[in-house]
Amino acid sequence: IWELKKDVYVVELDWYPDAPGEMVVLTCDTPEEDGITWTLDQSSEVLGSGKTLTIQVKEFGDAGQYTCHKGGEVLSHSLLLLHKKEDGIWSTDILKDQKEPKNKTFLRCEAKNYSGRFTCWWLTTISTDLTFSVKSSRGSSDPQGVTCGAATLSAERVRGDNKEYEYSVECQEDSACPAAEESLPIEVMVDAVHKLKYENYTSSFFIRDIIKPDPPKNLQLKPLKNSRQVEVSWEYPDTWSTPHSYFSLTFCVQVQGKSKREKKDRVFTDKTSATVICRKNASISVRAQDRYYSSSWSEWASVPCS
Amino acid sequence: RNLPVATPDPGMFPCLHHSQNLLRAVSNMLQKARQTLEFYPCTSEEIDHEDITKDKTSTVEACLPLELTKNESCLNSRETSFITNGSCLASRKTSFMMALCLSSIYEDLKMYQVEFKTMNAKLLMDPKRQIFLDQNMLAVIDELMQALNFNSETVPQKSSLEEPDFYKTKIKLCILLHAFRIRAVTIDRVMSYLNAS
């Protein structure tokens, strides 16, 4: 058993049929010694008396808010949560496996630049009685500071018969140098509590590996005289690290119709303009990627050919 | 420690091409190592990230773009003195800071070159003959060093009398390649910045 926060405790249980469970001793936070009784949740049934209560925690029915009283007055609470371990593996029931970039990916994180600011998100099908708390650091032994905000519900989607909820959090490394060469990874730890179930999820990464620039901005077309070719130009996204001559991007320019199966014109360039062949009912799209360290491409920025 | 904005004529920076070749060569070599040593811990997640130049050179700090010198997190107190002549310095107006930056890059390359050559000598003794260093990568390191053209003491190649542990050598190769790739990215960014200045 360990303390998650004040008056909230996590009991780690090996979860299998007829498991013996864990013996837990609760102590009432009071100077009083006599006339103390214990109850669980909203029940008025007295579980025991005395300053300490010893319980055998085996299942969710044994978890909950234990309260000690004296003469009708509440003295203190202890909330017990369960953390299940099945076949030596901690349960991951609360969050959905996103399977990208690999299986057992519950947290996904992205950074728009090298400033040390990043966003992580996760998915769940649970809609109520759900809380998250996020901590982060650079490195695990002798950790350096990363400050994370509160996790918020950022999107709701319908997937078949189920509703899916996306939560996200923004974090900022306390003293980040965009030019630094990372040798210690960022660690992100999410505590998830659904009703009386506790789970924790972690992710470890270098900012350089989660970079995904915003799409290029200000796409413009200029038809070339006596030609089917057009010159397309664009600018670096505002959120990208500066100076751009140091943090350079490379671009992919594509002309394509509405269907992905349609024919296309595609060219890669380090410049902020390119010449392509425009077709009727097609769009010109441009996306960006760090020129020197190949992490993710940005989303496409598009303009119609016409 | 920073790079001044007034530096060589645009497009005349002779080291940019070599640094691009360097990044390409080390990236290819790292990819080859990951594939060949698939049953060894050779991915970014599996290895310890060590920097053999730590406390010996200060490339990131010495080569910091002027725009980032206002960022206190980027300023490091490490002081390193280097020789200040080099053929990549295409303008007489080149400052001492830029010379310091380029000589720091040169020292990085020299250190990695020695490590890679020592390692290759060990890998050539491996009866499995599983992996060797790409000669192209070694050649590209040499070309960039020649383009930088700094005079400095020759670092003797480390020779070891004991029987090499090939497993450890291959793990060390992965660690070295990952670190060198990261440094090659920094070098490329620096050269691109200088070329544009």
Partner: antibody
Framework: QVQLVQSGAEVKKPGSSVKVSCKAS????????LHWVRQAPGQGLEWMGW????????EYAPKFQGRVTITADESTSTAYMELSSLRSEDTAVYYC???????????LGQGTLVTVSS | DIVMTQSPLSLPVTPGEPASISCRAS??????LHWYQQKPGQAARLLIA???QSISGVPSRFSGSGSGTDFTLTISSLQPEDFATYYC?????????FGQGTKVEIK
């Protein structure tokens, strides 16, 4: 299986024209760009131009501009390359090529040898 | 026009040994570079697109690298069926242009 079948070999006199055909099978004809590339004996490959069969748009290499015409007939899934004012240096194997990507080729025809000789 | 220069023009290799062919562009073409294989009397076949993207059906012993002006096609271990002429082609701008070809022959 995508295939491009070209017309047979031709012998032409200098100053005349030649029209080579390329019939496509497998996949929808208008879903691909069609190019013509030639190879003189013992020489490398030389790009001549492309057509978008969907709308008839064409683009020619400046070297052949005014002498080459590329057309396409969607009803027969056939593309044509006509080269006029032939000279001896036009002796080459002419290949048609196609791809959904405009700037390179994933399928090429078997080639048509055009000999220009007096 | 962008001029593509291949080297060497002829490359004698022992079967089972690796081979590397270089292609240089007269100006920077990013990764807009493709490799083809051509055997005598046959049409060319696409091996690699955009400098390093492998093509389905092409053996994994063929790999490409490079960007900007310098590109390399590598065959990790030459098989008897790999003896052929190899061409690079740039797609950075029209007109599309090819290298002059590298003939890989049995040593």
């Amino acid at each position: 299986q995508v295939q491009l079948v070209q017309s047979g070999a031709e012998v032409k006199k200098p100053g005349s024209s030649v029209k080579v055909s390329c019939k496509a099978s497998g996949g929808t004809f208008s879903d691909y760009y069609l190019h013509w590339v030639r190879q003189a004996p013992g020489q490398g490959l030389e790009w001549m131009g492309w057509i978008d069969p969907e709308n008839g748009d064409t683009e020619y290499a400046p070297k052949f501009q005014g002498r080459v015409t590329i057309t396409a007939d969607e009803s027969t899934s056939t593309a044509y390359m006509e080269l006029s004012s032939l000279r001896s240096e036009d002796t080459a194997v002419y290949y048609c090529a196609r791809n959904k990507e405009l700037r390179y080729f994933d399928v090429l025809g078997q080639g048509t040898l055009v000999t220009v000789s007096s | 026009d962008i001029v593509m220069t291949q080297s060497p023009l002829s490359l004698p290799v022992t079967p089972g040994e690796p081979a590397s062919i270089s292609c240089r562009a007269s100006q920077s073409i990013s990764i807009n570079l493709h490799w083809y294989q051509q055997k005598p009397g046959q049409a060319a076949r696409l091996l690699i697109a955009f400098a390093s993207q492998s093509i389905s059906g092409v053996p994994s012993r063929f790999s490409g690298s490079g960007s900007g002006t310098d590109f390399t096609l590598t065959i990790s271990s030459l098989q008897p069926e790999d003896f052929a002429t190899y061409y690079c082609q740039q797609s950075n701008s029209f007109p599309l242009t090819f290298g002059q070809g590298t003939k890989v022959e049995i040593k």
